[in-house]
């Protein structure tokens, strides 16, 4: 069986301030079992944007029903975008455990924020 891949098809997305941004992410396998998290940026300074397992992420909604066991689409929509949201977003698969461990990351999608049209 082929190892799971995390696919972020869009290299970049441009959104006007105040609008919503859709960031696409799919995985190619249901194995290993474990949650998806979204981060802005890479390395230790990365910001947690969405955690499938826990937390309250009011500006983020999942595009599909990510809680369904057979779901492989972990795309998200971030509402009310501001300039501070600009950056590269990574969809990251974790392997279930105590604690969960990072398994594989997508290649990233760069979000740029345009000025709100007047």
């Amino acid at each position: 069986e082929e190892e799971l891949q995390v696919i972020q098809p869009d290299k970049s997305v441009s959104v006007a301030a105040g609008e919503s941004a859709i960031l696409h992410c799919t995985v190619t396998s249901l194995i290993p079992v474990g949650p998806i998290q979204w981060f802005r940026g890479a390395g230790p300074a990365r910001e947690l944007i969405y955690n499938q397992k826990e937390g309250h992420f009011p500006r983020v909604t999942t595009v599909s029903e990510s809680t369904k066991r057979e779901n492989m689409d972990f795309s998200i929509s971030i509402s009310n975008i501001t300039p501070a949201d600009a950056g590269t977003y990574y969809c990251v698969k974790f392997r279930k455990g105590s604690p969960d461990t990072e398994f594989k990351s997508g290649a990233g999608t760069e979000l740029s924020v345009r000025a709100k049209p007047s």
Partner: antibody, heavy 119, light 108 residues
């Protein structure tokens, strides 16, 4: 119920150090950025520092950069502020504040810890 | 850096009357503005976020409006327990997070 409880305040002399702690409960601590905000006697609110959810990203106000260090222990649900080379102008109540999401306002505040720097 | 200017510095209002507080940003902050209430000797408490959304448990006599650079906090019928200092906070550009200088609301 979200609770943030600061401790470690006290009276110190200029140039000395102090470490504040903030014990968090009632929410998934490791999922949220946290902040320190201070308020000098009779003055308004001044943001001091921010740390991201994982602890690897930090930001500081210019007035404390190089002297204060923010950190967190997600296994203990605790936020810290290490304050070195304290000055009289650092005298304030220091509040720990939870961020609503990574790029957001402060939705819960602690009760505060008083730090007095005086010779 | 975005500067937030609150006016008036002090507002004296009779119980049951309307109180209107202003917060002006030096550049647009979209709708990314929050209002916090701080009663004497207490920690701040979130009232309003995203310019007009009431935080959990906040009475509906508190309302927020505005976008861009001009924002208003309205207390429709002032109660004695509303005596406090009110601060606006922007979170459109950061760091640093910025607060306004505050408006003190006194009961006549």
């Amino acid at each position: 119920d979200v609770q943030l409880v600061e401790s470690g305040g006290g009276v110190v002399r200029p140039g000395e150090s102090l470490r504040l702690s903030c014990a968090a409960s009632g929410f998934s601590f490791s999922s949220y950025a946290m902040n320190w905000v201070r308020q000098a006697p009779g003055e308004g609110l001044e943001w001091v520092s921010r740390i991201n959810s994982g602890g690897g990203g930090t930001d500081y106000a210019e007035s404390v950069k190089g002297r204060f260090t923010i950190s967190r222990d997600n296994s203990e649900n605790t936020l810290y502020l290490q304050m070195n080379s304290l000055r009289a102008e650092d005298t304030a109540v220091y509040y720990c504040a939870k961020q609503y999401d990574w790029n957001g306002f402060f939705d819960y505040w602690g009760l505060g810890a008083l730090v007095t720097v005086s010779s | 850096e975005t500067v937030l200017t609150q006016s008036p510095a002090t507002l004296s209002v009779s119980p049951g009357e309307r109180a209107t507080l202003s917060c002006r940003a030096s550049q647009t902050v979209g709708s990314k503005l929050a209002w916090h209430q701080q009663k004497p000797g207490q920690a701040p408490r979130l009232l309003i976020y995203d310019a007009s959304r009431r935080a959990t448990g906040i009475p509906d006599r508190f309302s927020g409006s505005g976008s861009g650079t001009d924002f208003t906090l309205t207390i429709s019928s002032l109660q004695t327990e509303d005596s406090a200092v009110y601060y606006c906070q922007q979170y459109y550009y950061w760091p640093p997070y910025r607060f306004g200088g505050g408006t003190k609301v006194e009961i006549k």
